[in-house]
Structure formats: structure tokens, C-alpha cells
């Protein structure tokens, strides 16, 4: 029993005086607990505890169940304890079934014994099969056996506590271990468009796809230099064990002009964190901006071919584009087209093919173009000498 | 700091018993799991026994179960291993080992790589 120097408080004594016990099922657990300033015994075993305000601990008939740590606290919170067995050949483990592990971090497979006099106490694959090869355990009769630096491959790894008994194995009831594993790559996000360009009234849009090893990842959608709070809708989906994929949709039900910038979608773990931003750019109305990529005057010799070209911007898309030259409407000889196949492409370009040109044939040829909300046109000068 | 000197081993004639024993000095011996591994000519080092640090609960690789028995006393921390009915495939020079945790591994074989110390060793020979 503990020393200490007189004066000092010092914790309470055990009757028996021994760390361990060892007593048969049906036997009597009698425990006295000696201190002047006794306050109560404590009982422990895996999930479980119970107190007791009497100083001798009495157990009539023991069962496995009493098999546990007992601890005897004083008034001063000093405390002693004694590790009781109760050796019963029908009920060789106590187990609480529950088994999580961090990846790389030790997990404890909770099937304390009831009698520590016992040989092979280890783990056993289920139906025989091996357990994995890089596998290993410490073992400790009063709290179970620890596996060792887990790892992702053991998730849904189903084992036994076993001991050797007369050369026979004896199983506890089965566990199955969790993987939970670590982060060990920053998310991977993507986005469902780069840019957005809108007008005002029209609804905003845009999905961030968030992968990673399991759904504790964090995310949200952000706007640049802003603290506003954004509403999100989630879905997300487990693809197989380690596969996991959230996606995180932010809506603007009616953009407006001053809700044009820049959106980060973040997300982080505990290894790091990534993002990627898409841009909204909402117009008050719709626009079309002609850019000629050649001069508007132009000068050609009879007999010569000429390639009038314009690149232009609408915004919505372009419903209605024609050349024309003196009231008319040319049908053929002129080709219009997306500048990219870009689904936010709005760029175009078109080209008027004019080819052996008379002397008679000069004049002004006007590129219109219009859409839903505007009509443009730009006029090319053409001189045949 | 922990020594470990093995003693007890020598020349036997099958079936026959020997008693291995190993003292340990310089820690605390009661807080080591303690084992003996052997290594016969030609072969790997392997497991044969261990006993945890409460001197109750023991190990056996299957090579041996049912005829070694290890066991330990702690006041003379020293750790013993009985052999009996030996065969010539015992013959060896057996190693006392000791770890503050020792790791197991499929079939309750201590892995060798979580010893903390090991004995110079002493030899066993069964002849038949």
C-alpha cells in the first residue's frame, strides 16, 4: 500500500493489499476500503460504471460481469484501486461490439478477459480466414486488445477476441472494425461553369462538386470581400467506402446588376484546403458590341475578291444576323459562326465572301445583327477601281 | 538499459527436458512482456513462448504448444522456459527477449520487431 510522509493526505487502502484478484464465479467479492475520509467506490469495466458510499464493497455471488476495476476515492480526491477477475469458463470475454479506428492511428478491440490465466490471447480472422498480413495487436487482459496503426485496407475487417483453451480456440462475438480514414490530400473541387453572364431578373445557378475520403470535409460557397452569408442546397453520394461527393448549389433566384463578382467555392480538411471560383457578370439588358476586323473603307480592283469580316458580342445569343447591299438581302456567300464551342462562348464571327468584284459593285455593305433586347449593324465603304 | 543472460541450455537426447533461464537486469522487469525466440541452423529466427507482464497470460507458437511452458518470477526477474519432450527440430540457440509493449501478430507470434532487448542467447541441441 502507498507511503507518504505524516501530514501529507494520503490515498486510501485496499483490503485485499493486491493490485490483481482473482476470484471464481459464484464466489464471494469482498473489498474494504480503509481511509478516515472515505467518500465512495467507483466500478469500471468497458462502457460501465457504478458507485457504492459503503467502504466495504461486497459482491455475495460474482459474475463475470463484476470483473472490473474498483477504485476507492477520499476527501482529498486521492484514490487507490484493485483489478478484480471473476474466472468463469463460460464467459472467458466481456466485449462491447463497437469498433472505429482512425487510419494510422491504434484502435482498442474491447474484449477485456475474465481470467487473465490464459494462453494465445490474440485476434482471429472470422471464418478462418488469416488476418491481413502487416496486421499488428497489443494485447491487455483488462482492456482489450489494441491493433496498431490502422489502416484502410482493415475497414470492414471482421475479427474474434480468441484464447487457447485444451488446445481448442474459444471466439468472442464478432466485431467488424470502421476505417475512418485521414485526410491526406487537400479536397478536389470543381465547378460547373467558370462564368456566368445574366440579366437582371434572371436566375443565378451554379453547382460546386467537392471529392474527398469521407463526408466530414468542410465547404461553402463565399463571395469575395463579403460576409454575407449564401443559401446552399446539398446532395451528395457515397461511391464506394473511401469515394465520397458532395455537391453544394448556390442560387440567386433573381440576379440583380450589384450581384455581379467573383463566387469561391472552399473547402478544407485537416490536411489543407482548395478552392475555385466562378464569375457572374448580370447586365441590366442584353447587348450586342461589333468589332470590324478590317478596315470599313475598303479599296479593291475590278476583277478582285474581298473577304469582309466582323467579330461581334451578343449577349443573349444572336437570333437574327444578314448582309445587305442595296436593300438586298444576300442569301449565300456569307458565313456566320460561335467564335468558340465554349458554352459561355459569346463571341461570333462573321464573313461576307465577295468575289471578282465589278466596277459596279462598289458601295456600302451593312452587317445587321439583333437579338432579344437590341439590334446593331455596322457598314463596310467598298471601292472597286 | 535492460541485460538480459540466457542459461540452461545444452545437449539432450530426444524427449528429454531442459530448463531455460533468463535474468534480466537494470529496469523494471515486471513491467516487460518477456518471450523466448530460437533460431536452428540455416533457419530464420522465429518465436517460441511469451508471457505478459502480469505473469498470467502466455503465448505459444504451434511448434511448441503442449510442451514448453513459460513462466516468470518477478522477485528474481527471471523468466524461465520448460522443455519437455524435445525433438531434434528444437535444436537451436534460443533467445530471452523483452518489450515494454510487445506486438502480436496473426496466430498470437510475437513480432520480433517490437523487442526492446535481447539476450546473447544459449544453445540447445537434441540429438536423436
Known amino acids: 500500500q502507498p507511503s507518504v510522509s505524516p501530514g501529507e493526505p494520503s490515498p486510501p487502502s485496499i483490503h485485499p493489499g493486491k493490485s490483481d484478484l482473482i476470484v471464481r464465479v459464484g464466489d464471494e467479492i469482498r473489498l474494504l476500503c480503509t481511509d478516515p475520509g472515505f467518500v465512495k467506490w467507483t466500478f469500471e469495466i468497458l462502457d460501465e460504471t457504478n458507485e457504492n458510499k459503503q467502504n466495504e464493497w461486497i459482491t455475495e455471488k460474482a459474475e463475470a460481469t463484476n470483473t472490473g476495476k474498483y477504485t476507492c476515492t477520499n476527501k482529498h480526491g486521492l484514490s487507490n484501486s484493485i483489478y478484480v477477475f471473476v474466472r468463469d469458463p463460460a464467459k472467458l470475454f466481456l466485449v462491447d461490439r463497437s469498433l472505429y479506428g482512425k487510419e494510422d492511428n491504434d484502435t482498442l478491440v474491447r474484449c477485456p478477459l475474465t481470467d487473465p490465466e490464459v494462453t494465445n490471447y490474440s485476434l482471429k480472422g472470422c471464418q478462418g480466414k488469416p488476418l491481413p498480413k502487416d496486421l499488428r495487436f497489443i494485447p491487455d487482459p483488462k482492456a482489450g486488445i489494441m491493433i496498431k496503426s490502422v489502416k484502410r485496407a482493415y475497414h470492414r475487417l471482421c475479427l474474434h477476441c480468441s484464447v487457447d483453451q485444451e488446445g481448442k480456440s474459444v471466439l468472442s462475438e464478432k466485431f467488424i472494425l470502421k476505417v475512418r480514414p485521414a485526410f491526406k490530400a487537400v479536397p478536389v473541387v470543381s465547378v460547373s461553369k467558370a462564368s456566368y453572364l445574366l440579366r437582371e431578373g434572371e436566375e443565378f445557378t451554379v453547382t460546386c462538386t467537392i471529392k474527398d475520403v469521407s463526408s466530414s470535409v468542410y465547404s461553402t460557397w463565399k463571395r469575395e470581400n463579403s460576409q454575407t452569408k449564401l443559401q446552399e442546397k446539398y446532395n451528395s453520394w457515397h461511391h464506394g467506402d473511401f469515394n465520397y461527393e458532395r455537391q453544394a448549389t448556390l442560387t440567386i433566384s433573381s440576379a440583380r446588376v450589384n450581384d455581379s463578382g467573383v463566387f469561391m467555392c472552399y473547402a478544407n480538411n485537416t490536411f489543407g484546403s482548395a478552392n475555385v471560383t466562378t464569375t457572374l457578370e448580370v447586365v441590366d439588358k442584353g447587348f450586342i458590341n461589333i468589332f470590324p476586323m478590317i478596315n470599313t473603307t475598303v479599296f479593291v480592283n475590278d476583277g478582285e475578291n474581298v473577304d469582309l469580316i466582323v467579330e461581334y458580342e451578343a449577349f443573349p445569343k444572336p437570333e437574327h444576323q444578314q448582309w445587305i447591299y442595296m436593300n438586298r438581302t444576300f442569301t449565300d456567300k456569307w458565313e456566320d459562326y460561335p467564335k468558340s464551342e465554349n458554352e459561355s462562348n459569346i463571341r461570333y464571327v462573321s464573313e461576307l465572301h465577295l468575289t471578282r468584284l465589278k466596277g459596279t459593285e462598289g458601295g456600302t455593305y451593312t452587317f445587321l445583327v439583333s437579338n432579344s433586347d437590341v439590334n446593331a449593324a455596322i457598314a463596310f465603304n467598298v471601292y472597286v477601281n | 538499459q535492460v541485460q538480459l543472460v540466457e542459461s540452461g541450455g545444452g545437449l539432450v537426447q530426444a524427449g528429454g527436458s531442459l530448463r531455460l533461464s533468463c535474468v534480466a537486469s537494470?529496469?523494471?522487469?515486471?513491467?516487460?512482456?518477456m518471450g523466448w525466440f530460437r533460431q536452428g541452423p540455416g533457419k530464420e529466427r522465429e518465436f517460441a513462448a511469451a508471457?505478459?507482464?502480469?505473469?498470467?497470460?502466455?503465448y505459444y507458437a504451434d511448434s511448441v504448444k503442449g510442451r514448453f511452458t513459460i513462466s516468470r518470477d518477478n522477485a528474481k526477474d527471471t523468466v524461465y522456459l520448460q522443455m519437455n519432450s524435445l525433438k531434434p527440430e528444437d535444436t537451436a540457440n534460443y533467445y530471452c527477449?523483452?518489450?515494454?509493449?510487445?506486438?502480436?501478430?496473426?496466430?498470437?507470434?510475437?513480432?520480433?520487431?517490437?523487442?526492446?532487448?535481447w539476450g546473447q542467447g544459449t544453445q540447445v541441441t537434441v540429438s536423436s
Open positions: 527477449a523483452a518489450a515494454f509493449t510487445p506486438e502480436f501478430r496473426d496466430g498470437g507470434i510475437w513480432d520480433d520487431a517490437s523487442v526492446d532487448y
Open positions: 537494470g529496469r523494471t522487469f515486471s513491467s516487460y512482456a
Open positions: 508471457i505478459l507482464s502480469n505473469g498470467l497470460t502466455t
